[in-house]
């Protein structure tokens, strides 16, 4: 269901903790006194808080912190991920037996940890499968016409267009639009073969597409995915968009009308993965050697020999299946109705691993952890934890899009973060993590109190690492959440700075996974400490643990990007100060809610509760009003795609400097106004009630 | 033709092991599970584990966990179960079968004729 | 684990006559999304090893006789001989596919009178 993005950041390296930045969001991180724990009962106790008022809170934040520490220690991670990559449950393609056999383990699993409530939500959806009779097929036709078979794959990529086409072949590198557009050669009317990394494969494809290439071939090069078979098989799907792409915009619950349509990013060319040995195979027939800069193994070659063609035949079919999401949940003792998501995907094509079997596995361990400490330990979360194994992942977050499409009205009033335990084990080296800004702080204070697993220090090792955060991308599952839904979510992993090079191949094994990763238990452990604690933040505190605060600085860089086109805007007859003005609201009211929050009486829930729903509009304000979420699903101004983005918008005006005939002003027009007014409706969000908000503007 | 070849009688000592074998024809190796099925003397099927040999994945019986050991040589078409610790409990005869590979659960359409183990001193 | 029950253990009956056979288990082998049953039936001839004849409850592999049927849906299916053959004599043993661990009941000892 739709449009597409990829994950990862730095913090790396060694040394002991340091001292975080403030922020909006981060006033009430330490946990509650005994007092505020008591707020809401039948007669709160009221204290002004004394002297020892932040030690006390601490050391009930060190007390939870402990207690799940205590249970890390004691859980046998490596078990469930080696149960969960048994033939029992692998592989498991979305909405086969195996994936269903998996969903009911997991579901029982959670009415054995005894959460509060368990249930699954249905769907029927339609992906693409390999077709079971005819198979696909690359080849390539000599000038007199014989045929040299080159492979039928194992692998496929879902949403191809399934056709037949012949022509020329090209290499173009990662396929890349700043590859495409380096190219010396021209790839109109050519098939293209690319590497796979880098990019995901429906942004290859719609690449490719708008070069007007006329089909793809991806496979991985020795150098990005040093594995030693060659014929390994590669899966992965080419819909630049998340959910099934035949109900975009909406949920595919069985009792909805489905009217006839299709995600616009579904490809209109046909996209096949091919072996090393087959991509090698055809580097045979090929001349030109591939420039120094694109660090490739020497095999690789530029363009296909004179009077020769390749031939592509994808005959992959559509397929209804039934999904099933698991959810279940521990209610909050204080706003059950507000809640963190805790997700994973568990389908896999392939035995999946590192793909789906970790993620399910912290899943399942979290579970039970967070269940113990309420029913045993007496923690009591303000708020409540959900849950959430999603099926069809593999095919663009369909499991969780779905759910997310099928309740966009209400969600993001009732569903705050959401945290994605998907590929969260990789590697060792690093400590990588994308997210909302709006969870910056959250992340600061966690990576200063987990250590890594194996050199022992804390994570938290460069002040400077908010800068260096890689966007959220189309293939992770937080990206729906964050740009469709306008929840702030987040995705991280201990990883290594090259790809995993088992994802989506038949080699993604528990074996294989526990001999990169001799440490699999420690990291695994490490991981779910992270996730734990943000789980308690997120829940335990008083203020919802967003810091608002931190979009000050998007905007602020947002706008020195515009700077740079001042004469570019003036010569338009247009201003920046209606711009500078909504951000300066935006300012305001991050400083005003702060002051309100300082001066909250913090044992009043009904003045707390107040502030926080002003917290939680924040993240979904940051959706463009002015787009259709069926039309353009990720409307979120920063993270999204599409016109609306700030970034096309200065994409626009780039335009306008290298090209004043492409340059589209009225188009120019409309995003300056559009921005304009959807900033100036989160800061009018941030700032409560109609009253208080100045209209001078 | 489609075949498993397993070889006739293995005579083990007490708490050793065995290795035993059964070489696949007439297939593609990689597309179907290996399944071994232990019967004893008079006695009923009982399902030991099975092996994918695309992805070297495997699954046991509980009872089995510990006791046997799958793995495959790919190269050869041929795939292995290691009995260890034997006990006169484990004279039986060992049959390997197959049963497809994918994502649902299969039967099994072809059987080797079975290895008889003895154990004893 | 998914209990297989067989009766009766054995029967001997005459060449040419019908002949039943039952097999329970401890839950349902109906798989809801595709409707089918996972259930097999085995010959074990004297000496021989398993021979599949009838797998997904009812339908028989190719080049077994069609005087062999099996029935039943959910927990409780039929392996029916229609004319008995003297060839026949074997134990029938059924297995459920639908998890793992894979079980099998304890079989149908079918003698010749």
């Known amino acids: 269901h739709h449009h597409h993005h990829h994950h990862h950041h730095h913090s790396g390296g060694g040394g002991s903790g340091g001292g975080g930045s403030g922020g909006g969001g981060s006033k009430g991180v330490e946990p509650k006194t005994e007092s505020e724990r008591l707020a809401g009962t039948e007669s709160p106790v009221r204290e002004e808080p004394g002297e020892d008022f932040p030690a006390a809170r601490r050391l009930y934040w060190d007390d939870l912190k402990r207690k799940l520490s205590e249970k890390l220690d004691s859980t046998d991670f490596t078990g469930t991920i080696k149960l969960l990559n048994e033939n029992s449950y692998v592989p498991r393609e979305a909405g086969s037996q195996k994936d269903e056999n998996l969903a009911l383990y997991v579901e029982n699993q959670f009415r054995e940890f005894k959460l509060s409530k368990v249930w699954r939500d249905q769907h029927f959806v339609k992906i693409q499968v390999k077709d079971s009779i005819g198979q696909n097929m690359v080849t390539i036709v000599q000038s007199n016409g014989n045929l040299d078979p080159v492979e039928s794959p194992e692998g496929y990529v879902a949403f191809s267009k399934p056709t037949e086409v012949s022509g020329k072949l090209v290499h173009a590198n990662f396929g890349t639009k700043k590859d495409f557009e380096e190219l010396s050669y021209s790839v109109n009317g050519s098939l293209v073969i690319v590497r796979a990394g880098e990019i995901t494969f429906a942004e290859k494809v719609a690449n490719a597409q708008s070069f007007n290439a006329i089909g793809v071939l991806i496979y991985m090069d020795k150098n990005k995915f040093p594995v030693v078979e060659a014929d390994l098989a590669l899966f992965g799907h080419a819909h630049l968009g998340t959910g099934d792409p035949y109900t975009p915009g909406f949920p595919s619950f069985n009792h909805t009308q489905f009217p006839p349509s299709q995600s616009s990013g579904l490809p209109n060319i046909p996209v096949q993965t091919i072996s090393r040995a087959a991509a090698e195979k055809l580097f045979g027939k090929m001349e030109g050697s591939c420039p120094a800069r694109w660090n490739i193994d020497s095999s690789c070659k530029l363009e296909l020999s004179q009077n020769q063609n390749v031939k592509l035949i994808v005959k992959n079919v559509l397929k209804e299946i039934k999904i099933l999401n698991i959810f279940g949940v521990i209610k909050g003792f204080v706003e059950p109705d507000h809640y963190v998501v805790v997700g994973a995907q568990r389908d896999a094509w392939g035995p999946g691993a590192a793909k789906s079997g970790v993620g399910t596995a912290l899943l399942l361990k979290l579970a039970q952890m967070f269940s113990d400490m309420v029913l045993k330990d007496g923690f009591q979360p303000s708020r409540s934890i959900i849950f959430a194994s999603w099926s069809a992942g593999d095919f663009g977050s369909v499991g969780a899009t779905e759910w997310l499409e099928g309740y966009l009205s209400s969600l993001h009033l009732k569903a705050f973060t959401y945290i994605n335990l998907d590929k969260a084990v990789l590697g060792t080296s690093n400590f990588k993590v994308s997210a909302s800004p709006l969870l910056y702080t959250l992340i600061e204070k966690t990576m200063q109190n987990v250590k890594h697993p194996v050199t022992g220090q804390f994570l938290y090792q460069d002040s400077n690492w908010a800068s260096k955060v890689e966007k959220l991308t189309l293939d992770n599952a937080a990206f729906p959440f964050l740009a469709y839904s306008g929840i702030p979510a987040v995705s991280f992993c201990f990883c290594e700075d090259t790809d995993y090079p088992y994802l989506g191949t038949t080699m993604d094994t528990y074996k294989e996974l526990i001999e990169r990763i001799p440490e699999l238990n420690k990291v695994a452990r490490a991981a779910a400490e992270v996730a734990g604690q943000f789980v308690i933040k997120l829940t335990h505190d008083v203020e919802l643990n967003l810091d608002y605060e931190m979009y000050n600085s998007k905007l602020l860089s947002f706008m020195k990007d515009l700077n740079q086109f001042k004469t570019d805007i003036r010569d338009m007859g247009l201003s920046l100060q209606w711009l500078y003005s909504a951000r300066g609201d935006y300012f305001r009211a991050t400083s005003r809610l702060t002051t309100d929050f300082h001066n909250a009486e913090k044992t009043n829930r009904f003045v707390m509760r107040e502030i926080n729903d002003r917290i939680m509009k924040v993240e979904y304000h940051f959706l463009s009003p002015y787009v259709s979420p069926r039309e353009s699903p990720f409307r979120h101004i920063f993270w999204g795609s599409g016109s609306h983005t700030l970034s096309a918008l200065v994409e626009n005006l780039k335009l306008r400097q290298k090209n004043i005939t492409a340059f589209n002003e009225t188009l120019f027009r409309n995003q300056l106004a559009l921005a304009t007014w959807t900033i100036q409706g989160v800061a009018n969000a941030l700032s409560g009630d109609i009253w208080n908000i100045d209209n001078e503007f | 033709e489609v075949q498993l070849q397993q070889f006739g009688a293995e005579l083990v000592k007490p708490g050793t092991s065995v290795k035993i074998s059964c070489k696949a024809s007439g297939y593609t190796f990689t597309d179907y599970n290996m399944d071994w099925v232990k019967q004893g003397h008079g006695k009923g099927l009982e399902w030991i584990g099975d092996i994918n040999p695309n992805y070297d994945t495997t699954s046991y019986s509980q009872k089995f966990k510990g006791k046997a050991t799958l793995t495959v040589d790919k190269s050869s078409s041929t795939a292995y179960m290691e009995l260890r610790s034997l006990t006169s409990e484990d004279t039986a005869v060992y049959y390997c079968a197959r049963s497809e590979a994918g994502n649902y659960y299969w039967y099994f359409d072809v059987w080797g004729a079975g290895t008889t183990v003895t154990v004893s001193s | 684990d998914i209990v297989m029950s067989q009766s009766p253990s054995s029967l001997a009956v005459s060449v040419g006559e019908k002949v039943t056979m039952s097999c329970k288990s401890s839950?349902?082998?109906?798989?809801?999304?595709?409707?089918?049953?996972?259930l097999a039936w085995y010959r074990q001839k004297p000496g021989q090893s398993p021979k599949l004849l009838i797998y997904?409850?009812?339908t028989r592999e190719s080049g077994v006789p069609d005087r062999f049927t099996g029935s039943g849906s959910g927990t409780d299916f039929t392996l029916t001989i229609s004319s008995v053959k003297a060839e026949d004599l074997a134990v029938y043993s059924c297995q459920q596919y639908y998890n793992y661990p894979y079980t099998f009941g304890g079989g149908t000892k079918l003698e010749i009178k």
């Open positions: 997904w409850a009812s």
């Open positions: 839950q349902s082998l109906l798989y809801s999304s595709n409707r089918k049953n996972y």
